[in-house]
């Protein structure tokens, strides 16, 4: 059937709660493509009816919520003008018992995000909530060892928990909780995070790999909106920063007044041996001065750029 088969290296382990997976495969999904989800090699696509417990929402597959029987291999087929890619995603569902007193303690943490705080520094934890636009997430609450986190050293800022002057006592089992609303129904999302403390600061010795961009040019029409992802793989324990710069200045600072070009919020997916980070740059309106300028994605010591260029004139139109 002429598709390139691509398999995820890890199993995604999820609890009986809302779960979503986005079928993106950079840089394949950067052009015009169609995405269709299937389960267990079925020829029948996953429903697109939003009332269905499992349905496709744009490029996402959405489970509201996930159940035991949902374990299996899901395929998303990405069809482009001259290519087809079939991504195989293995989902395994298991029951989480967070702070159920009858169970006692926390669940098996095999699927938890592992995050690091740096001793003596001001640092942060991130609550990874990846859902399509149709899902509205309420404010996030943070817990440590089943107790809600309070205190002046801790500040909740959007999806992050800011921790000032990190101490050794900050290691342990954390959870972030949010209420997700979809089509008028509410669901609870609870993500666990195992936190360790390190004294190592700054550049962690790993060299991040920038998957995309690849030091290339992008043809884009004047006046259009453009979003470009920077996709980076790095070790799980890395302390590298990822950002977009232009003229050696952070884009958010460079375009501070007009806010015409902005850096997006970083997201990441956790894999067996590494993390895949994505941070995008958004051009609200491409202007003439943007052409020929290298927009640099930085990840630790690694860099890669894109250069915008005007499309070649299409003489067939004349």
């Amino acid at each position: 059937d002429g598709c390139k088969d691509i398999f995820m290296k890890n199993e995604i382990l999820s609890a009986s709660q809302p779960f979503a997976f986005n079928c993106t495969f950079p840089p394949i999904t950067s052009g015009e493509v169609s995405v269709t989800w299937y389960k267990n090699s079925s020829k029948i696509p996953v429903s697109k009816i939003i009332q269905s417990r499992i349905h496709q929402d744009e490029t996402w597959i959405l489970f509201l919520p996930m159940e035991w029987g949902d374990s299996g291999v899901y395929q998303c087929v990405i069809k482009g003008r001259d290519s087809c890619h079939r991504i195989h995603v293995n989902l395994t569902v298991f029951e989480k018992h967070w702070c159920d007193t009858s169970i006692g303690g926390l669940p098996n943490l095999s699927d938890e995000y592992k995050q690091i705080l740096h001793l003596g520094k001001d640092d942060s934890l991130t609550c990874h909530l990846h859902f399509p636009k149709s899902c509205v997430l309420g404010p996030i609450k943070w817990y440590k060892d089943c107790n809600e986190i309070k205190g002046e050293r801790f500040t909740v800022l959007e999806t992050r928990l800011l921790v000032s002057n990190v101490s050794a006592e900050d290691r342990g089992n954390y959870a972030c909780q949010a209420i997700l609303t979809h089509s008028g129904k509410q669901y609870e999302v609870l993500n666990g995070i195992t936190v360790s403390i390190t004294e190592r600061a700054g550049y962690g010795g790993s060299v991040p790999k920038i998957i995309y961009p690849k030091n290339h040019s992008i043809e884009v029409q004047l006046g259009t909106t453009l979003i470009v992802d920077c996709n980076v793989t790095d070790t799980k324990d890395n302390t590298n920063l990822r950002c977009w710069r232009v003229n050696n200045t952070l884009v958010d600072d460079y375009y501070d007044e007009s806010k015409r070009i902005r850096e997006g919020v970083e997201t990441h997916v956790s894999f067996r041996e590494h993390n895949l980070y994505t941070v995008n740059i958004t051009f609200l309106e491409v202007k003439m001065e943007d052409y020929g300028l290298p927009f640099m994605c930085h990840a630790g010591v690694s860099t890669a750029y894109i250069i915008l260029q005007l499309p070649a004139p299409d003489f067939r139109a004349y």
Epitope: G2, K4, I6, N10, K209, E273
Partner: antibody
Framework: QVQLVESGGGVVQPGKSLRLSCAAS????????IHWVRQAPGKGLEWVAI????????HYADSVKGRFTISRDNSKNTLYLQMNNLRAEDTAVYYC???????????????????WGQGTTVTVSS | DIQMTQSPSSLSASVGDRVTITCRAS??????LNWYQQKPGKAPKLLIY???SLQSGVPSRFSGSGSGTDFTLTISSLQPEDFATYYC??????????FGQGTRLEIK
């Protein structure tokens, strides 16, 4: 440095068996799919088989299916090719080669080969 | 299976020449095309992957282009060490991985 070293080649009679080995060093062996590729004297390259990074799947060229078995021992950083019922047309230099790590966090049934061994010669003759 | 056809089968050129080798797939393979160089008695060496990406350590005089069914390997200015056999290989529809029959580049 990143290296693959084949061994186990030799002269063998038709119908007999031979086992090739490929020792890897300088990279995390268990993260990569590995291929066997062969080249008959004076001929082009022919892909033989691939084994995925964790040994969970193997794929073979039609010409060797049912006769050759690819396997790996990640604890020993070693790849194997068990060749049974050998034929004269199996005479070739056999190379092991590392699959391109084109997609971090994902794997495929083979993308290309970025690191090659020096080759080991198998001659099938009566 | 996808067939890969290279042309020409052999080619004579001089140092400093610009050389082009083409590879055609029997069906669209998107950009899943790799190029290798092989010298007598040696293992092949990856030059270009994903149709146009230069493998680390390969001189910039080598370049690749194409998408779909038609692909090109170009050597902008031939050096003495470039005389070898070149193979294309598809990895779109696998298994099996398939190679072209090779192009032998000789000194004129």
């Amino acid at each position: 440095q990143v290296q693959l070293v084949e061994s186990g080649g030799g002269v063998v009679q038709p119908g007999k068996s031979l086992r090739l080995s490929c020792a890897a060093s300088g990279f995390t062996f268990s993260n990569y799919g590995i291929h066997w590729v062969r080249q008959a004297p004076g001929k082009g390259l022919e892909w033989v088989a691939i084994i995925l990074y964790d040994g969970s799947n193997q794929h073979y060229a039609d010409s060797v299916k049912g006769r050759f078995t690819i396997s790996r021992d990640n604890s020993k950083n070693t790849l194997y090719l068990q060749m049974n019922n050998l034929r004269a047309e199996d005479t070739a230099v056999y190379y092991c080669a590392r699959d391109l790590d084109l997609w971090s966090g994902y794997y495929t049934n083979g993308d290309g080969m970025d690191v090659w061994g020096q080759g080991t010669t198998v001659t099938v003759s009566s | 299976d996808i067939q890969m056809t290279q042309s020409p089968s052999s080619l004579s050129a001089s140092v400093g020449d610009r050389v082009t080798i083409t590879c055609r797939a029997s069906q669209s393979i998107s950009s899943y095309l790799n190029w290798y160089q092989q010298k007598p008695g040696k293992a092949p060496k990856l030059l270009i992957y994903a149709a146009s990406s230069l493998q680390s350590g390969v001189p910039s005089r080598f370049s690749g282009s194409g998408s779909g069914t038609d692909f090109t390997l170009t050597i902008s200015s031939l050096q003495p060490e470039d005389f070898a056999t070149y193979y294309c290989q598809q990895s779109y529809s696998t298994p099996p991985i398939t190679f072209g029959q090779g192009t032998r580049l000789e000194i004129k």
